[in-house]
Structures are given as structure tokens and as C-alpha cells.
């Protein structure tokens, strides 16, 4: 009779994670007798799958009933494929003997690829918030991929954006993959609603790609313009001054008064109107009793938006004996270059 | 259903030969090494000879030389050919399987008595 | 050739009692051994293969332990059908060898 030869007819077997893998050995005699072991790797330092004759294998299956002496089908299943699996799998005959069975034929071995999900992309903009006409760089990351082929793509409000840098490791061979992204995006005051998109493909995905988004409301800080204006007297010593401020985000906004340097009261944004582009607007007045003040009376409105350094715009009120008009201030910020006096 | 059957056994005197024989039914006869065991009255077990799946044999020093082994696959029978018999091969003798993959046995016949006297 | 040795040679027990009955091999014999239990006037009946695998059909109060040279085996639970003579077997070279045997009798 021939010598036995172990035969592993698939040179590579692919199984997406989490799947079953079989992988197929048959030895062509029943003799010598002896135990089959399944291995991954060659050499000292290669791993035991499975023993036919001792051992706990949990993950591990035969295909046929391996306790028959006229087996020779030593195919294997392994459960729940991971890509911490992947590797060249050895069927090895061995004589049996003692005080140890003697290794005695393998097979050419079996490389297991495990096809691994990419997980979902996670995008991540700046700590801080920044201004429009700034460049802000947004980040993505994805782990445990296999193989190492992928794609990455970044999109702003549909647009395909190519300002970006994508790393893919390790560089080398791996059981699985990680990629990292970073994008650069220049901020309009329209962002409020825009989104930022890290788009993923990768063939476990069967053409449907994974997406991660970014609201550039979280990254966004549009600052507020400011306009004070004088409104019609409501009395005769009395003149109403508003403080529009417009188009600003995110809503954290306070609001001050001064009259000459001193402040008369301070308020928060809390009624605010929201803009088509999420900006928001508000309205601040201050009734100014004009008999109380002998000369004239600086208005300064001074507004602190989401922390940052105070903006102001002021108004100068003329204080004479006997008003007949009122008009608008409508001076650049901090300052009070056109006046009203009122008569 | 697996079964094994013995037969041929008697009385023989010392010197003379005997064949026994065993029908092996339910199981593919020829994927497996086949044995004897015998044992002697109020005693214990004694393994007496192996015929592998490619005919290769083996016996124990005390029956060498004088028991001989044998398949026939293609009827699904073991014989053991016994010469130069003595009082001392008195026994039953018991065909089995070699069924589990290491070769341990795992099928027994009824046995067949076997004596040696004059 | 390896030489067998069971102990005790016999042992009485009572019903439900545990038992160990012992077997020694005059060399290393890996785990190739295998168990067997016989009746009076009955053929051996295969009880385990490689020291601690259970024979197809065999209850699981019987199991079997060790390696090397020095293996057990273990009825858990003793019931009246258990009452018999068992054989220990070295399969790792030819000649197989059995031990003498251990007859297990009722107390």
C-alpha cells in the first residue's frame, strides 16, 4: 500500500468575520494509526487548533465522526471567525507512540483570509470653535478591517472635498487594519447647517458604504454684527434705544448696557429668532429718561458671544431743553461718530 | 447493527491445529484492523494477534510462530489458523474490532471456546 | 513487553459508593489505554479509549484519568449492573497487553 499522504485541497479559504470556516484535509491511507492535529503557523512556535486525541476545542468541529478507525476525513470547522484568525493552517498526521506520537505527514497547509467589517466612522472635529474664512481640520478614524484595501472620502453638503490626508495601518501584514483621515474645511458664515461627511468603502460592504458625519454647528462661531438705534421718544423725556444683534452662533450670548462708561443693565439671549442659516437674531432696548442726564449720555450696547471678547457698539444721546427729533446711529463698532441731538 | 461472530472452536489434542473463524457483519469490514484475544478460565484477558487493514500482522511471543492471522475482505471474515496447539491455548477466543481511531478495541464477539487435551 | 498492573485485585463496595480502581504501566504508554468491563460467561465490553474518551452508549458515572504511566478510572455512582471484573489496556505498541484485572463485588 501506498504511504499515506495528508491532502488540504484549498490552497486559501476567505470567511468574513463572524462566519464559519471549514477547513478541508483528507489523508489517502488508514495507516499508520495515529492522531491528526491541526495547526496555524509551522515551526516551535506554531499554535494547536485542534488534537484528535485530547484536548478542549470549543470553537472546533470535525466534519466527520473522527473516533472511527476508517475515517479519513479530518476536515475541521472553526466558529466565529475572527480576524485574530487569519493565518496558514497545517493537518498533520501523526504515528502513534510513545512517551509521545510521533509527527509523521502534513499537509500543505491552508491560508485562512478573514474578510472584516470596517466599523463605523468616527468623526471628530476641533476642541474649539472657529470663525468663518478659518480652516478647521476634522478627523476619521475606522478599525478592524481586512483585507487592507479601502477607500476614503470626505464630503461637505454633498460636495466632495479633496483636501485631505488618509493613513492606512499598519503598513505591513496584519490580522486586521485601522485608517485615520484628516481633512482640511474652510468655514462660511453659512455652515450653521452644513454637515461634514467621512464616507468608508470596502468590499464587506457589498457597495454600501459606511458614513460618519460632523455638524459644523459643533465646530462653527459665527460673531454677531450689532446695530443700536434711537426709536421714537415714548415721552417727552424719555427716548428708546435698541441694540439689534444678528446673525450670530451659537446662542451663549450677553448682553450689556452702559450709560457713559456705567453699566444700567445686563442681559442673556433667551427669545431669540432663528435665520434660514441657523444664525440667530436678537433685540435688546433701553429706555433712556433724558431729563435725568444734564449733559449728553454715551449709549454703549457691549455683547459677549460664546465667551469671546466683548464687541460693542455705542450712541450718542445730546441732552437740550427742547427735543423735536430723533434719528439712527448708524456708526461703525465702538464707536459714536454720528449723533442725534434732541431738541 | 455491528456484530461480530465466532466460530470454529472445540476440542483438539495437544500438537494438533484448529481454524477459527469470525463473521463480521454491519460495518465495512475491510477499514479495519481486526483482533484476537483470548482468555483462559477464571482468567485473565490475553491478546493473541492483529491483522491490519493492509494485511500487515503482529503476535505476542508465546502463539508466534505457531497462530497465524488472516482476512478474506471481500467476505467480511477473520480466521486465525492455530498449529502446534497446546493445553496452555485452552481458552475463549474472541474476535474484535479495532474501531476507534487509535485501534482501540470497541466490538467484541461472543467468543469461541477453544480446548487443547488429550 | 509492557507490563500491566491493576489494583486492588478485588474490592467490595455498596450501591451508590464511588470507586477507583487503579492501573500502572511498567513504561510510558502516552494515553493509549483503554478500559473494559466483563460479566461472568460475557464478552468484554469496551468502556474508554485514550485513558479518558467514553465508548459510544457508555454512562458517564464511568470516567478515566491519567497519563504516562499511571491512569484511573472512576465509577461515580455504583449501581447493581456495575458489579463486574474490569481490565485496563495498553494499545500504544504491540503485543497489547491487558492488566489482571479488579473484580468489583457488592459488599
Known amino acids: 500500500e501506498e504511504e499515506l499522504q495528508v491532502i488540504q485541497p484549498d490552497k486559501s479559504v476567505l470567511v468574513a468575520a463572524g462566519e464559519t470556516a471549514t477547513l478541508r484535509c483528507t489523508a489517502t491511507s488508514l495507516i499508520p494509526v495515529g492522531p491528526i492535529q491541526w495547526f496555524r503557523g509551522a515551526g516551535p512556535g506554531r499554535e494547536l487548533i485542534y488534537n484528535q486525541k485530547e484536548g478542549h476545542f470549543p470553537r472546533v468541529t470535525t466534519v466527520s465522526d473522527l473516533t472511527k478507525r476508517n475515517n479519513m476525513d479530518f476536515s475541521i470547522r472553526i466558529g466565529n471567525i475572527t480576524p485574530a484568525d487569519a493565518g496558514t493552517y497545517y493537518c498533520v498526521k501523526f504515528r502513534k507512540g510513545s512517551p509521545d506520537d510521533v509527527e509523521f505527514k502534513s499537509g500543505a497547509g491552508t491560508e485562512l483570509s478573514v474578510r472584516a467589517k470596517p466599523s463605523a466612522p468616527v468623526v471628530s472635529g476641533p476642541a474649539a470653535r472657529a470663525t468663518p474664512q478659518h480652516t478647521v481640520s476634522f478627523t476619521c478614524e475606522s478599525h478592524g478591517f481586512s483585507p487592507r484595501d479601502i477607500t476614503l472620502k470626505w464630503f461637505k453638503n454633498g460636495n466632495e472635498l479633496s483636501d485631505f490626508q488618509t493613513n492606512v495601518d499598519p503598513v505591513g501584514e496584519s490580522v486586521s487594519y485601522s485608517i485615520h483621515s484628516t481633512a482640511k474645511v474652510v468655514l462660511t458664515r453659512e455652515d450653521v447647517h452644513s454637515q461634514v461627511i467621512c464616507e468608508v468603502a470596502h468590499v464587506t460592504l457589498q457597495g454600501d458604504p459606511l458614513r460618519g458625519t460632523a455638524n459644523l454647528s459643533e465646530t462653527i462661531r459665527v460673531p454677531p454684527t450689532l446695530e443700536v438705534t434711537q426709536q421714537p421718544v415714548r415721552a417727552e423725556n424719555q427716548v428708546n434705544v435698541t441694540c439689534q444683534v444678528r446673525k450670530f452662533y451659537p446662542q451663549r450670548l450677553q448682553l450689556t448696557w452702559l450709560e457713559n462708561g456705567n453699566v444700567s443693565r445686563t442681559e442673556t439671549a433667551s427669545t431669540v429668532t432663528e435665520n434660514k442659516d441657523g444664525t440667530y437674531n436678537w433685540m435688546s432696548w433701553l429706555l433712556v429718561n433724558v431729563s435725568a442726564h444734564r449733559d449728553d449720555v454715551k449709549l454703549t450696547c457691549q455683547v459677549e458671544h460664546d465667551g469671546q471678547p466683548a464687541v460693542s457698539k455705542s450712541h450718542d444721546l445730546k441732552v437740550s431743553a427742547h427735543p423735536k427729533e430723533q434719528g439712527s446711529n448708524t456708526a461703525a463698532e465702538n464707536t459714536g461718530s454720528n449723533e442725534r441731538n434732541i431738541y | 447493527e455491528v456484530q461480530l461472530v465466532e466460530s470454529g472452536g472445540g476440542l483438539v489434542q495437544p500438537g494438533g491445529s484448529l481454524r477459527l473463524s469470525c463473521a463480521a457483519s454491519?460495518?465495512?469490514?475491510?477499514?479495519?484492523?481486526m483482533h484476537w484475544v483470548r482468555q483462559a478460565t477464571g482468567k485473565g484477558l490475553e491478546w493473541v494477534s492483529v491483522?491490519?487493514?493492509?494485511?500487515?500482522?503482529y503476535y505476542p511471543g508465546s502463539v508466534k510462530g505457531r497462530f497465524t492471522i488472516s482476512r478474506e475482505n471481500a467476505k467480511n471474515s477473520l480466521h486465525l489458523q492455530m498449529n502446534s496447539l497446546r493445553a496452555g491455548d485452552t481458552a475463549v477466543y474472541y474476535c474484535?474490532?479495532?474501531?476507534?481511531?487509535?485501534?482501540?478495541?470497541?466490538?467484541w464477539g461472543q467468543g469461541t471456546m477453544v480446548t487443547v487435551s488429550s | 513487553d509492557i507490563q500491566m498492573t491493576q489494583s486492588p485485585s478485588s474490592l467490595s463496595a455498596s450501591v451508590g459508593d464511588r470507586v477507583t480502581i487503579t492501573c500502572r504501566a511498567s513504561?510510558?504508554?502516552?494515553?493509549?489505554l483503554a478500559w473494559f468491563q466483563q460479566k461472568p460467561g460475557k464478552a468484554p465490553k469496551s468502556l474508554i479509549y485514550?485513558?479518558?474518551s467514553l465508548q459510544s452508549g457508555v454512562p458517564s458515572k464511568f470516567s478515566g484519568s491519567g497519563s504516562g504511566t499511571d491512569f484511573t478510572l472512576t465509577i461515580s455512582s455504583l449501581q447493581p449492573e456495575d458489579f463486574a471484573t474490569y481490565y485496563c489496556?495498553?494499545?500504544?505498541?504491540?503485543?497489547?497487553?491487558f492488566g489482571q484485572g479488579t473484580k468489583l463485588e457488592i459488599k
Open positions: 513504561q510510558d504508554i502516552n494515553n493509549y
Open positions: 474484535a474490532r479495532g474501531g476507534n481511531w487509535d485501534d482501540a478495541l470497541d466490538i
Open positions: 491483522i491490519g487493514i493492509s494485511g500487515d500482522t
Open positions: 485514550t485513558t479518558s
Open positions: 454491519g460495518f465495512t469490514f475491510s477499514s479495519y484492523d
Open positions: 489496556q495498553q494499545y500504544v505498541s504491540y503485543p497489547y497487553t
